[in-house]
């Protein structure tokens, strides 16, 4: 947020930049927070976009059967391992098909044991405040997914008939990390010293963060011809004199004719 | 990357043999899988003889005792002789090979193909 500044009086300004504003030779560079040509207004809103979207990933064990463990294996950038990883991706797509949020699986280890594959599923969705839920009845629908085709897909006298066969007592959920977003956190964190008077109001499902000088939203102070400004014990009303009125009051609602007070009588609207 | 080529495909009578052979590139022969697969007209892709590294092999139980599966390291080639053909053994057969160690029927599972030999069984 800048303000550009033309004249003798700029060197003045220079070193009056407030609130850690730095002076770039024509104005105060402010800070994300402060604004004005001092950098003395704090702002009204903050941008804490949400993320467009939020992840989830499951760290799972899987034994597959119809695969005979070799050391290559182990190997990452063997061919023995690039197949196996093939197969196995192919296999996953088919298994987790119906879930919206599934990106894809990230095999991070093949062991010994018939061959064990440690990997991660990859969940995925659009950011709404319901992020959480719609994530963990993904991760359910996985691990019943994952249940059902390692307890169906099995070898009948050593030979499977499927893309893969499991060791239907070889599947575990290890652990489940989901993208933590607080908007409300994020708001006061970024409000700094004025954390106590910024909230979060949403609009169309997206996350605002607002102190009540923001006008429009159910917590805005209306300092009707006045002006809102933030300082550090909370939002006040600036009230304005015009040629004809005084105002004031805390939300500059009372009005006083100038007329009235020179002929000394004071008269409210 | 593994490249397959069959030969030995033809029309036969009932009753009568043929050997088909499968040339293979690639320095991957003597490890993972190999097999034959086919294809008949209107039908899915089935698995008629596997052969893995480890020794284990596998028949279709249509064609046991009359199909045998072997291979020449040396010459990289993997075979198919089928011998008393029947009518119901017309299709197209391909060989297939993984350098895993499958123990899988199934073709999805398999990573390289060659492009087929037909084989017709007709009086």
């Known amino acids: 947020r800048t303000t550009t500044c033309f004249g003798d009086g700029c060197q003045n300004t220079a070193s009056r930049c407030k609130n850690g504003g730095t002076w770039d030779g024509l104005k105060c560079q402010c800070p994300n927070l402060y604004y004005g040509e001092l950098c003395e207004e704090v702002v009204s809103s903050i941008d804490i976009g949400p993320p467009e979207t939020i992840s989830a990933q499951m760290e799972l064990t899987v034994t597959v059967t119809s695969v005979k463990f070799t050391e290559e294996l182990k190997n990452h950038s063997s061919q023995e391992f690039q197949e196996f990883k093939q197969t196995f991706t192919e296999q996953m797509n088919i298994v987790y098909s119906g879930i919206p949020e599934y990106v894809g699986v990230n095999i991070t280890k093949l062991r010994l044991g018939s061959v064990v594959v440690e990997h991660d599923v990859l969940l995925r969705t659009k950011y709404t405040p319901e992020y959480k839920t719609v994530l963990d009845n993904a991760t359910e629908v996985v691990k019943e997914k994952i249940t059902k085709v390692t307890t169906q897909q099995i070898m009948i006298n050593d030979i499977c008939s499927d893309m893969m066969c499991f060791n239907t007592t070889g599947t575990q959920v290890q652990n489940i990390t989901v993208t933590q977003y607080d908007p409300e956190e994020d708001c006061r964190k970024m409000a700094k010293e004025y954390g106590d008077y910024f909230v979060v109001e949403y609009r169309d499902q997206k996350p605002y963060c607002i102190s009540p000088c923001e006008p429009g939203f159910s917590v805005s102070k209306n300092c009707n011809l006045g002006k809102c400004q933030m300082s550090l014990s909370g939002p006040q009303c600036l009230c304005v004199t015009t040629e004809t009125h005084w105002y004031s009051g805390e939300t500059c609602n009372q009005g006083t004719q100038k007329s009235l007070v020179y002929g000394h009588h004071h008269h409210h609207h | 990357e593994v490249q397959l080529v069959e030969s030995g495909g033809g029309v036969v009578q009932p009753g009568g043999s043929l050997r088909l052979s499968c040339a293979a590139s690639?320095?991957?022969?003597?490890?993972?899988?190999w097999g034959w697969f086919r294809q008949a007209p209107g039908k899915e892709r089935e698995a008629v003889a596997l052969?893995?590294?480890?020794?284990?092999?596998f028949y279709a139980d249509s064609v046991k005792g009359r199909f045998t599966i072997s291979q020449d390291n040396s010459k990289n080639t993997l075979y198919l002789q089928m011998n008393s053909l029947r009518a119901e053994d017309t299709a197209v057969y391909y060989c297939?090979?993984?350098?895993?160690?499958?123990?899988?029927?199934?073709?999805?599972?398999?990573?390289?193909w060659g492009q087929g030999t037909m084989v017709t069984v007709s009086s």
């Open positions: 297939a090979a993984s350098v895993l160690v499958l123990r899988t029927l199934n073709p999805k599972a398999w990573h390289h």
């Open positions: 690639g320095d991957t022969f003597s490890r993972g899988s």
């Open positions: 052969i893995s590294s480890d020794g284990w092999t």
